[in-house]
């Protein structure tokens, strides 16, 4: 039961953690202009990964992409990079973590590759997240640093009468959307990473054993046990008192020399 | 067609208040910021504050913070200047203006002359 | 708060001749985010309320004659009308879009030589 739930709610808290990741790549606020100085005014400026928009008082907004590659700073790409790396793991951490789900059956899928796939979908969540994580931090610290730059030469003046204002840019939106949702997918990722644990098989050091009297055929299969969730039967922990019939899950188990005493 | 329709000429003693209106129609009145003008007998123009009608947000020429109110009733399009302690100095004529794109002005009405006289 | 200032105070211009309005703001108007100019032109005749004629700078309104030009950057801008004709007797402002308090030139009077 526990690792079912804690399996689900890894699967949720990571489809939430993308979607924000996504939401996060798209929003055009990853630094608004700074208004400590002007704290109303009629030009308000922001800007995204791929575009930069202007906010007029009119309630005109006008934004315009960044219509180029080479012109643009290497750190700006390496942030885009670096959310779309996060994007696609994320994306492919949730299809594998759809058919890793306990509670969805998918043919004759064995436990063990179930515990696989939850694996594989959490180390994907993790880096997902950490991409975002990082992505989001390079953009914040490129940020900062043209921030202080900015305020060091704020007015270029001419003679002392005429002020060129140059606008400054702090933390936008974004910024914290893609720090809380590359968290949520972090923390999605580990709940998978946990729950695999609780999903995968324990390995028996030694094999069943058969135990035949006359006319009856007793079957007792020691050890073998998996960590119950609570749901369903424990079908590999039966024993059978009924002259050869086997499970399904015993016909899997062939007989070795070592199975007749 | 847009037009911006003001109330009448207004005769007041110092001290008192004046409610000057500006009736819009031909357009989206939420959709647009309405600006208030002074203007006085053969001087410039003098910008009072701007008036967001969607939400009521108001900014003020520092000169007016405290004397003029602008207000806007979204039910009727209709834009509103307060402006408060009337003074003979306030003897101008008054224009309601639309904001659009570029912070330009471009529909304007005919304005309000308001006299202050004892 | 942003001053503008324009010059000359008043002109006359031959019919057919050529305008030249100069208008100086105390701080720049352009906007790194757009790169464009926030300075707004304005026509105004006796009696009559403004007319606006350029935004941006340089940008003309619609229905406005393509005799009236702006150009400028920054701090330093020009209204001209290329062939001045009777209709354009007027005063002309200009008026800062950038920032609040939103500022206006003290007008320049155009008149006919």
């Known amino acids: 039961m526990a690792v079912t739930a804690c399996q689900g709610l890894g699967f949720v808290v990571s489809l939430i953690g993308i979607a924000g990741i996504i939401a996060a790549t798209c929003m055009d606020q990853w630094s608004t202009q700074d208004l400590y100085n002007n704290p109303v005014t009629a030009v308000f400026n922001y800007q995204g990964l791929w575009r930069s928009c202007v906010r007029e008082s009119s309630g005109f907004t006008e934004c315009r992409g960044y219509f180029t590659l080479l012109g643009l700073p290497a750190m700006l790409q390496a942030v885009r990079a670096l959310m779309i790396v996060g994007i696609v793991l994320g994306a492919i951490g949730l299809l594998v973590s759809i058919f890793a789900l306990k509670c969805i059956r998918i043919g004759s899928m064995e436990d063990s590759a179930k515990a696989n796939m939850t694996l594989t979908s959490g180390i994907m969540f993790i880096v997902s997240g950490l991409c975002a994580i990082a992505g989001v931090s390079v953009f914040a610290n490129m940020l900062v640093t043209n921030f202080w730059m900015s305020t060091a030469n704020m007015y270029t003046g001419m003679g002392g009468m005429v002020q060129t204002v140059q606008t400054r840019y702090t933390f936008g939106a974004a910024l914290f959307v893609g720090w809380v949702a590359g968290g949520l997918t972090l923390i999605g990722g580990v709940m998978m990473c946990i729950a695999c644990r609780g999903l995968a098989p324990e390995e028996t050091n030694y094999k069943a054993v058969s135990y035949h009297a006359s006319g009856h055929s007793v079957a007792y299969k020691p050890g073998g046990f998996k960590a119950s969730t609570g749901f369903g039967s424990n079908t590999k922990n039966k024993k059978i008192y009924d002259g050869g019939a086997r499970t399904e899950d015993e016909v899997q188990s062939y007989p070795s020399k070592h199975d007749y005493v | 067609q847009v037009q911006l329709v003001q109330s009448g000429a207004e005769v007041k003693k110092p001290g008192a208040s004046v409610k000057v209106s500006c009736k819009a129609s031909g357009y989206t009145f939420t959709s647009y910021v309405i600006n208030w003008v002074k203007q006085k007998t053969g001087q410039g123009l003098e910008w009072i504050g701007e008036i967001h009608p969607r939400g009521g947000n108001t900014y003020y020429s520092e000169k007016f913070r405290g004397r003029a109110t602008l207000t806007a009733d979204k039910s009727i399009s209709t834009a509103y200047m307060e402006l408060s302690s009337l003074r003979s100095e306030d003897t101008a004529v008054y224009f309601c203006?639309?904001?659009?794109?570029?912070?330009?002005?471009?529909?304007w009405d005919q304005g309000t002359t308001v006299t202050v006289s004892s | 708060d942003i001053v503008m200032t324009q010059s000359p105070s008043s002109l006359a211009v031959s019919l057919g001749e050529m305008a030249t309005i100069n208008c100086k703001s105390s701080?720049?108007?352009?906007?790194?985010?757009?790169?464009?100019?926030?300075l707004t032109w304005y026509q105004q005749k006796p009696g009559q309320p403004p007319k606006l004629l350029i935004y941006w700078a340089s940008t003309r309104e619609s229905g406005v004659p393509d005799r009236f030009s702006g150009s400028g950057s920054g701090t330093d801008f020009t209204l001209t009308i290329s062939s001045l004709q009777a209709e354009d007797v007027a005063v002309y402002y200009c008026?800062?879009?950038?920032?609040?308090?939103?500022?206006f030139g003290q007008g320049t009077k155009l008149e006919r030589k």
């Open positions: 203006a639309r904001l659009r794109r570029g912070n330009a002005m471009d529909y």
């Open positions: 701080q720049s108007l352009l906007n790194s985010g757009n790169q464009r100019n926030y």
């Open positions: 008026q800062n879009s950038y920032n609040y308090p939103y500022t």
